[in-house]
Amino acid sequence: VSITKCNSDMNGYCLHGQCIYLVDMSQNYCRCEVGYTGVRCEHFYL
C-alpha cells in the first residue's frame, strides 16, 4: 500500500494522532496516539 503524509488541508483532521494518506485507497487514515480511538482519534479510553 502506497502511503504519504496528508495534504495541508487535513491539518487538524486527526484530533489525537497522525494523519496518513493511503494513496491506493484514496483516503486519509488517522494513526491514533495511545489511549485514543475512533476514525479521527476523537475518543479517549482508559
Epitope: 495534504n7 495541508s8 479521527r40
Partner: antibody, heavy 116, light 106 residues
C-alpha cells in the same frame, strides 16, 4: 451504500437567500469534511468552501466570504450551504462533496435558479 | 488561494490520437492533484488522484504525471466515449479547480 442526497431545485429572486441541504447515509459526517462546489450553466467547477462537522470549523473561498455560510447538524447527519444576496450569476448546480475518509464522493447536485 | 492554470481550454483530436492537458499551480501542491471527466448533464467523475493514481474501473489509457507546480494528464489513444470536459483539481491547500478542457473529436 454510502449516499449524499441533496435537496430539490430552487427558484429564487435576486437579493434573496437559498439554503441547500445535503443528507448523508451509510457514513457519519463527523468522520469527514463536507465540501461545496458549484457549476454555472456552461461554466467550469468552482469550489466554495467546506466544513469539518466534528469541530464545526469552516473555510470559504475568499470571494464568497460574508455571503456563504456552511453548517452541519451531526444529529441528523446533514450539511447545509446557505448563500445570501443572490444575483443572476449565482444560477448554478450546487454539489456537496465528501472528503477525508474517501476521496471526493459527490451528491447529485441541486439546481438553484435566480430570476426576477 | 492557489491558482490553477489549465491549458488548452479546448482541443480537437482524431480517434486514436494522444491527448495531453496541462495544469500549472501558482505554488508547489506536493502532487495533490486530481483529474475529473465531466459529460453534459452529469456530475464530474474522478479519474485520477494524487497525480497518477487511477481510480478503480478507469481505463488504463488515462494517466497523470508531474510534481511541484507542473502536472500533465494524458489520454494515450482517444476514444469516442472520451468526449467530455476535463478538470484538474488541487487539494493540497483547500481546493481550486482548473478552468477545464473541452475535448472534441475531429
Amino acid at each position: 451504500q454510502d449516499q449524499l442526497v441533496q435537496s430539490g431545485a430552487e427558484v429564487k429572486k435576486p437579493g434573496a437567500s437559498v439554503k441547500v441541504s445535503c443528507k448523508a447515509s451509510g457514513f457519519n459526517i463527523k468522520d469527514t469534511y463536507i465540501q461545496w462546489v458549484r457549476q454555472a450553466p456552461g461554466q467550469g467547477l468552482e469550489w466554495m468552501g467546506r466544513i469539518d462537522p466534528l469541530r464545526g470549523n469552516t473555510k470559504y473561498r475568499e470571494r464568497f466570504e460574508g455571503r456563504v455560510t456552511i453548517t452541519a447538524d451531526t444529529s441528523t447527519n446533514t450539511a447545509y450551504m446557505e448563500l445570501s444576496s443572490l444575483r443572476s450569476e449565482d444560477t448554478a448546480v450546487y454539489y456537496c462533496v465528501r472528503s477525508g475518509t474517501l476521496f471526493d464522493f459527490w451528491g447529485q447536485g441541486t439546481l438553484v435558479t435566480v430570476s426576477s | 488561494d492557489i491558482q490553477m492554470t489549465q491549458s488548452p481550454s479546448s482541443l480537437s483530436a482524431s480517434v486514436g490520437d494522444r491527448v495531453t492537458i496541462t495544469c500549472k499551480a501558482s505554488q508547489d501542491i506536493h502532487k495533490y492533484i486530481a483529474w475529473y471527466q465531466q459529460k453534459p448533464g452529469q456530475a464530474p467523475r474522478l479519474l485520477i488522484q494524487y497525480t497518477s493514481t487511477l481510480q478503480p474501473g478507469v481505463p488504463s489509457r488515462f494517466s497523470g504525471s508531474g510534481s511541484g507546480t507542473d502536472y500533465t494528464f494524458t489520454i494515450s489513444s482517444l476514444q469516442p466515449e472520451d468526449i467530455a470536459t476535463y478538470y484538474c483539481l488541487q487539494y493540497d491547500n483547500l481546493r481550486t479547480f482548473g478552468g477545464g478542457t473541452k475535448v472534441e473529436i475531429k
